[in-house]
Interface confidence: low
């Protein structure tokens, strides 16, 4: 006859372990105990538990409480025992001796793999400014055993490295993402991706990319500087820029104060009807915490009269 | 004893490819990187890329556009293919071996590479 | 690319001498840095990881220190088997090496 198990038994953390020990003999060949012992290498034997064909099952008072057979229907020729809520210390070799007769002792080992499912952590790096170089935007860290593999899953441009560090009996494995941080990356999301044999699917995290930036100010209003004339009403400077934070305007006349009737309402600056009271050098102020930004223009409110007359002028003078 | 060999043909006429193996033996190069470096006669260290033992490259960006990588795991050989060769690829060709960071611990013996026609 | 500026070019030094060679980034790589020895017609042999961690079998006479852009190797009580071209290299993104220095009898 011969003994039947499995060379690696592979179990998750906290489950049973069922330790495969079946004796495939000859007609009428009869086991007569079976004894379990944990067979590290180069610490010598440790008895688990006795397999008696009379007097059924003896734990050692080390796995007192954890070691039992299988559920009925049980075969006679059946050695399994079940190892009650694997722990990573229960990793590692185990023997199964079968004492049969008439054919004598068989022996055979099996080693119990402990997985450990990792529980992932993500760290946002510190805040992104458009402009600077290469820079940390998240490091994702999971420990389990074996080794995790932590991998990144986004559509952003950037170089991740990783680095393990080995625990006695556990790996943790950190990965960064690093990129140049751009105003396109906003609201990206960048998910950290964790994939262990005791996961029954892979973990992700995401973090959402938030970049500070602050686009240059532009005024409109001033294309057509034939309407910027006096009596004209609803005329309007509006102040053009983008940012993340979204910014906040100001607008400010650099050649003395706002003219009275003038109306600030955000990036929008409205004038009452137009009077030569109202040219000068007007400034929107555009800030928020990343940066500020200023964009200046002219304002020239034409006089109709003055022009007619130069009109004539020119006329005459031909 | 990780130990890496390259081998392949000492000279290369220009416009050709130039193609050279690296085979790793007395280690395991699973979750290990295997790079190609290369140093002209008499200059400094040019990293040309990497490929993981799962079949993933790394380029050099300056050279992307014609250095292929590429892996047999099952005879544990790596080759390089620098197409469209000119006299500045003639160098000494290294493999090496690294971890995860790109720094290298074990590295071949090297094999020059000479372009000319 | 990050370049990587390796200073001096070449020295000259005596047995038991101390030997000092800079590396600077031209950005902040952290400790993200290696060195290297080569000898004449020889491949690279890895000295020191991660700016600070002697490698397997290197002696203790040398060690590197620095972080950001500015990294040293020393190499205290010179042997003679230290007369080599030493490089520093980077592996923070695409990896380059300094131009070496080599360091030769007096």
């Known amino acids: 006859g011969e003994l039947e198990t499995s060379d690696v038994v592979t179990v998750v953390l906290g489950q049973d372990a069922k330790l495969p020990c079946f004796y495939r003999g000859d007609s009428g060949e009869q086991v007569g105990q079976v004894a379990w012992a944990r067979v590290d290498a180069g610490e010598g034997a440790q008895e688990l538990a006795l397999l008696h064909s009379k007097y059924g099952l003896h734990v050692s008072p080390a796995y007192e409480g954890r070691v039992e057979q299988p559920p009925p229907p049980r075969n006679p020729l059946d050695g399994s025992v079940l190892l009650r809520n694997a722990v990573q210390a229960d990793e590692g070799e185990y023997e199964c001796r079968v004492s049969t007769f008439p054919a004598g002792s068989f022996q055979a080992r099996l080693r119990l793999r402990v997985l450990v499912p990792p529980l992932p952590s993500l760290n946002p790096g510190p805040a992104l400014e458009e402009g600077q170089g290469l820079t940390l935007a998240a490091s994702c860290t999971a420990e389990g055993s074996p080794a995790p593999s932590v991998t990144w899953d986004t559509e952003v441009k950037g170089t991740t490295s990783s680095r393990s560090f080995k625990h006695s009996r556990s790996a943790a494995v950190t990965s960064e993402f690093h990129l140049v941080p751009s105003r396109s990356m906003n609201g990206q999301p960048l998910t950290c991706v964790v994939s262990h044999p005791g996961l029954l699917q892979d973990q992700r995290i995401t973090h959402i990319l938030h970049v500070s930036f602050l686009a240059e100010a532009s005024v409109r209003g001033l294309e057509d500087q034939n309407l910027w004339h006096i009596g004209r009403e609803g005329a309007m400077l509006k102040c053009l820029s983008e940012g993340q934070p979204p910014p906040s305007y100001n607008w400010t006349r650099l050649d003395g104060p706002l003219p009275s009737g003038v109306r600030v309402d955000g990036d929008t600056l409205g004038f009452p009807p137009l009077t030569t009271e109202h040219s000068g050098i007007y400034v929107c102020h555009v800030s928020n915490e990343f940066s500020s930004r200023d964009s200046q223009v002219t304002v020239d409110v034409l006089d109709p009269q003055e022009d007619s007359g130069k009109q004539v002028d020119l006329v005459s003078a031909s | 004893q990780v130990q890496l060999q390259e081998s392949g043909p000492g000279l290369v006429k220009p416009s050709e490819t130039l193609s050279l193996t690296c085979t790793v033996s007395g280690g395991s190069i699973t979750n290990y990187g295997v790079h190609w470096i290369r140093q002209p006669p008499g200059k400094g260290l040019e990293w040309l890329g990497v490929i993981w033992s799962g079949g993933s490259t790394d380029y050099n960006p300056s050279l992307k556009s014609r250095v292929t990588i590429s892996v047999d795991t099952s005879k544990n050989q790596f080759s390089l293919k620098l197409s469209s060769v000119t006299a500045a690829d003639t160098a000494v060709y290294y493999c090496?071996?690294?971890?995860?960071?790109?720094?290298?611990?074990?590295w071949g013996q090297g094999t020059l590479v000479t372009v000319s026609s | 690319d990050i370049q990587m500026t390796q200073s001096p070019s070449s020295l000259s030094a005596s047995v038991g001498d101390t030997v000092t060679i800079t590396c600077r980034a031209s950005q902040n790589i952290y400790s993200n840095l290696a060195w290297y020895q080569q000898k004449q017609g020889k491949a690279p042999k890895l000295l020191v990881y991660a700016a600070t961690n002697l490698a397997d079998g290197v002696p203790s006479r040398f060690s590197g220190s620095g972080s950001g852009t500015d990294f040293t190797l020393k190499i205290n009580s010179l042997q003679p088997e230290d007369f080599a071209t030493y490089y520093c290299?980077?592996?923070?993104?695409?990896?380059?090496f300094g131009g070496g220095t080599k360091v030769e009898i007096k």
């Open positions: 090496a071996r690294s971890g995860k960071w790109y720094y290298f611990d074990y």
């Open positions: 290299q980077h592996f923070w993104g695409t990896p380059t």
